[in-house]
């Protein structure tokens, strides 16, 4: 019946029989063995009925035996309850008393065990874990239960097995059985395919910047399966990452900061049981210079009737290799002073009295000048000359 689970394939030991061959011509009747002797090494297979949740014990004998009080049909004892002992008295006309008393130690129900895949998803690309789980309680002595696994040519006598250092994306077959008092009562087979492995490292072909705000990276994809790329670019402590389509082999980086070193890392990844990132390929470049931003917080203050003190704060973005501050002083449209300092601190002396001046301060980074900060200021009349004149009157 389909309801039966074949729960065993144990080796059957044939019942021992002996024949005495007489050397005389007198006909003698050979003596029969006792049934206890004849069936001393009888073995049993247990078959489980999923619907009734009862076992049938199949007696491994060559002839149809009788079972005393217990009825047995075709050498099968039916309706055995899990984890209960049943005594069977075995007899046959080929043997004499005493009968063989066989104690049937019935195993736990088959559905109380489940073969569980205990592989950690993070390690599922190179490991397999299988474990028998008891999903319901039973009264059988667990000491009498043994577990066996065979995966390829490896055999394990454990309830749980771990196979390591496997190849990703490979199929592995494991057969397992559970024995109760050395009688197999259930088995299971699992074919497990290891997960996708981490993709390989992309091969960067070139990585460079030919402008102040742009850079380019090109690469060859890795050999192994992958879904997409992650490109990260790091400047100082700032990190930006982009998700790139798997078919890309080039990416143009935009809106970069001028005269800045960028470290790029490119890795492929695959979304499998978990996301697996491949090794990152690294490269770096420095963007070209650009005009610096404007100096700020510029002040022009009078230190005398015809002297000024000009100060400013550095630009927020230098955008180049060097640091130099320039001050241009104009009267009307005529350039009257042009000074350059390491710091934005200028003392402008000996200007014309009572004159309107325009002060233009800007930063130069060695490659480009920045936009000037412009302030207007007027010198005073010569108060000393005025006092001197006043004194004479």
């Amino acid at each position: 019946s389909d309801a039966y689970l074949n729960a065993s394939e144990t080796t059957t030991l044939s019942p021992s029989g002996s024949a005495v061959i007489s050397t005389t011509t007198i006909a003698t009747t050979p003596s029969k063995p006792t049934c206890d002797e004849k069936y001393a090494n009888i073995t049993v297979d247990y078959l489980y009925n999923k619907e009734t949740k009862l076992f049938t014990a199949k007696l491994n004998v060559n002839e149809n035996v009788e079972c005393g009080n217990n009825t047995c049909t075709n050498n099968e004892v039916h309706n055995l309850t899990e984890c209960k002992n049943a005594s069977v008295s075995i007899s046959h006309n080929s043997c004499t008393a005493p009968d063989k008393t066989l104690i049937l130690d019935v195993p736990p129900g088959v559905e109380k065990f489940q073969l569980h895949d205990c592989t950690q998803v993070e390690k599922a690309d190179t490991t397999i874990c299988l474990k028998w789980k008891n999903i319901e309680t039973f009264t059988c002595d667990t000491q009498n239960i043994t577990y066996r696994f065979q995966c390829g040519n490896m055999i394990f006598d454990n309830k749980e097995i771990k196979l390591e250092n496997l190849e990703p994306e490979h199929e592995y077959k494991c057969d397992s059985e559970i024995l109760y008092n050395n009688h197999k009562f259930t088995n299971a087979s699992k074919i497990i395919k290891t997960d996708f492995g981490s993709p390989g490292e992309p091969q960067i072909i070139f990585c460079r910047s030919e402008a102040a705000h742009q850079g380019v990276i090109t690469w060859n994809p890795p050999q192994r399966s992958f879904h997409n790329f992650t490109l990260c670019y790091i400047k100082e402590t700032e990190k930006d990452c982009l998700n790139l389509d798997k078919n890309l082999i080039k990416y143009d980086l935009q809106n970069l900061k001028p005269y800045t070193k960028y470290v790029l890392s490119l890795h492929a990844y695959i979304i499998a049981k978990v996301q697996r990132n491949g090794s990152a390929a690294m490269c770096h470049f420095t963007t070209k210079s650009a005009p610096p931003s404007q100096v700020w917080n510029m002040t022009v203050s009078m230190t005398s009737d015809n002297s000024m003190h000009v100060k400013c704060r550095p630009p927020r973005d230098r955008n180049g290799p060097h640091e130099r501050y320039h001050l241009e002083v104009e009267a009307g449209n005529t350039l009257v002073r042009n000074e350059s300092h390491k710091n934005c601190d200028f003392r402008v002396k000996d200007l014309q009295y009572s004159t309107d001046y325009t002060f233009k301060a800007y930063f130069h980074n060695g490659d480009y000048p920045g936009e000037p900060f412009i302030l207007h200021h007027s010198t005073s009349y010569n108060s000393k000359a005025h006092h001197h004149h006043h004194h004479h009157h």
Epitope: S301, G332, S354, T358, L375, H376, H377, S378, S380
Partner: nanobody
Amino acid sequence: QVQLQESGGGLVQAGGSLRLSCAASGRTFSTHAMGWFRQAPGKEREFVAAIAWSGGSTYYADSVKGRFTISRDISKNTIYLQMNSLKPEDTALYYCAATNGGAWHYHERYFGSWGQGTLVTVSS
């Protein structure tokens, strides 16, 4: 603080002229420059022209260069804005402003004193 009073606004045809005046009183000796700003409806206030009080140097926004002239009369503590070849886009409220003293530029943050404004309307 300097007190400022504008006058001279009004309605004029496109291509016509107007002359605005701004009389200053109070601490006029502390100001280094005076100027004109304007604000059209729904727009931000913008610089028009300025004049250095002592030296008389003049400065103009690109949009009015060649059409407007700023001048001053120190004896009257007054500045003027002569507006020629007026266009409809010159329509705005015109403000007179004076600097706080010290260095200055065209941005309104350098101007600490402001008049109430005089309305100029240029019809097409």
